[in-house]
Interface confidence: medium
């Protein structure tokens, strides 16, 4: 079938509506053409002439089919804690998202208005809920038998190593230290085990299921741009 020809402007019959990419002009009382993305209405339609469209100027845009008299201004340049993930063009607004290690504390329709650094859990606390693009990290105290010796926004509480003979018992912020006798956990024979550097752990490691003695979830700290809470640092 041939393409359907749009004879705009035309009057819509009562009960009907203007077609896709057309709008009803109240003054002309006609169905008139919309302007394509990247354009705006320079001259509105009349009973005998259709809409005249013009391209958006630099730093302005229209994302949808429209009949606006002026294009929208692109948002201001991205701040230092943001990354420009979509440039300003005639057809789309600039989109700024938070750089790694930050989350969006105040979002807007597209992108982020205000970024904040992800909370870091201090030693003795691990990540209960990881940060996302729009939510902060939630820290929790390490349960008995687990520890975290780092200040990190990604590290979870890890289980203490199990020693045949304990030299120094572990606590919430330090791993157990074994005597020269090999610990149950696999390691080089005769060596005193020290915890591995946290950086080698995957950010996506799931929190270890906790024993029945673990504190209740009432210990979970609030999400969102709250002031540093116990177990977290402000830096």
């Amino acid at each position: 079938l041939p393409a359907q020809v749009a004879f705009t402007p035309y009057a819509p019959e009562p009960g009907s509506t203007c077609r896709l990419r057309e709008y009803y002009d109240q003054t002309a009382q006609m169905c008139c053409s919309k302007c394509s993305p990247g354009q705006h209405a320079k001259v509105f339609c009349t009973k005998t002439s259709d809409t005249v469209c013009d391209s958006c100027e630099d730093s302005t845009y229209t994302q949808l089919w429209n009949w606006v008299p002026e294009c929208l201004s692109c948002g201001s340049r991205c701040s230092s804690d943001q990354v420009e993930t979509q440039a300003c063009t005639r057809e789309q607004n600039r989109i700024c998202t938070c750089r790694p290690g930050w989350y969006c504390a105040l979002s807007k329709q597209e992108g982020c208005r205000l970024c904040a650094p992800l909370r870091k859990c201090r030693p003795g606390f691990g990540v209960a809920r990881p940060g996302t693009e729009t939510s902060d990290v939630v820290c929790k105290p390490c349960a008995p038998g687990t520890f975290s010796n780092t200040t990190s926004s990604t590290d979870i509480c890890r289980p203490h190593q199990i020693c045949n003979v304990v030299a120094i018992p572990g606590n919430a912020s330090m791993d157990a230290v074994c005597t020269s006798t090999s610990p149950t956990r696999s390691m080089a024979p005769g060596a005193v085990h020290l915890p591995q550097p946290v950086s080698t752990r995957s950010q996506h490691t799931q929190p270890t299921p906790e024993p029945s003695t673990a504190p209740s979830t009432s210990f979970l700290l609030p999400m969102g741009p709250s002031p540093p809470a116990e177990g977290s640092t402000g830096d």
Epitope: Q4, V5, Y10, P14, R19
Partner: antibody
Framework: EVQLLESGGGLVQPGGSLRLSCAAS????????MSWVRQAPGKGLEWVST????????WYADSVKGRFTISRDNSKNTLYLQMNSLRAEDTAVYYC?????????????WGQGTLVTVSS | QSVLTQPPSASGTPGQRVTISCTGS?????????VHWYQQLPGTAPKLLIY???NRPSGVPDRFSGSKSGTSASLAISGLRSEDEADYYC???????????FGGGTKLTVL
């Protein structure tokens, strides 16, 4: 298959009443405006009435205004035309028709028609 | 008398091109309302032939075309065939009547 089937026509005396029905099938009835169009023997087409999909708005030809009522029951996929105070000049084949889409409103599906004869 | 005026008859020989006119006024075609064309073969219900001035529903051959200018519209049939012998009606909305109006119809004869 999209279909419209009219019924209810027949012989009626002047001043009498008749109710025409149009059973729709094969499409989402409530989404379409519907019309009644009539054709007197040997004459051209004459628009009678239109009703939008929801039933909220109706229009009538001057020749039937105040005597005919168009209505629809979307739960039964049926269009109606209640005809009162019938006159000899109302004698015609009555067609129900569906309007295409929401835009141009051409009548793209027609029933086979039902004959209404008003005579004493 | 119909609000939209059509010639009562038109004729042509097979293969010929025939045009049927439909003249309205400032309250219907001239007001910007689109024109629809219907074909009624003898003894059958009407069929939508052209809608929105120039658009063909699926199944309608491209021998049929419609156009509109000012207060009138026209239907053109090229490569005329014997099966095109029928009555043709134009229709549009009319503001002053607040209703849909049909032309009086044109009987097309293929000689």
């Amino acid at each position: 298959e999209v279909q419209l089937l009219e019924s209810g026509g027949g012989l009626v005396q002047p001043g009498g009443s008749l109710r025409l029905s149009c059973a729709a099938s094969g499409f989402t009835f409530s989404s379409y405006a519907m019309s009644w169009v009539r054709q007197a023997p040997g004459k051209g087409l004459e628009w009678v009435s239109t009703i939008i999909g929801s039933g909220a708005n109706t229009w009538y030809a001057d020749s039937v205004k105040g005597r005919f009522t168009i209505s629809r029951d979307n739960s039964k996929n049926t269009l109606y035309l209640q005809m009162n105070s019938l006159r000899a000049e109302d004698t015609a084949v009555y067609y129900c028709a569906r309007h295409e889409g929401y835009y141009y409103y051409g009548m793209d599906v027609w029933g086979q028609g039902t004959l209404v004869t008003v005579s004493s | 008398q119909s609000v939209l005026t059509q010639p009562p008859s038109a004729s042509g020989t097979p293969g010929q091109r025939v045009t049927i006119s439909c003249t309205g006024s400032s309250s219907n075609i001239g007001a910007g309302y689109v024109v629809h064309w219907y074909q009624q073969l003898p003894g059958t219900a009407p069929k939508l032939l052209i809608y929105g001035n120039s658009n063909r529903p699926s199944g309608v051959p491209d021998r049929f075309s419609g156009s509109k200018s000012g207060t009138s519209a026209s239907l053109a049939i090229s490569g005329l065939r014997s099966e095109d012998e029928a009555d043709y009606y134009c229709a549009a909305w009319d503001d002053s009547l607040n209703g849909r109006v049909f032309g009086g119809g044109t009987k097309l004869t293929v000689l």
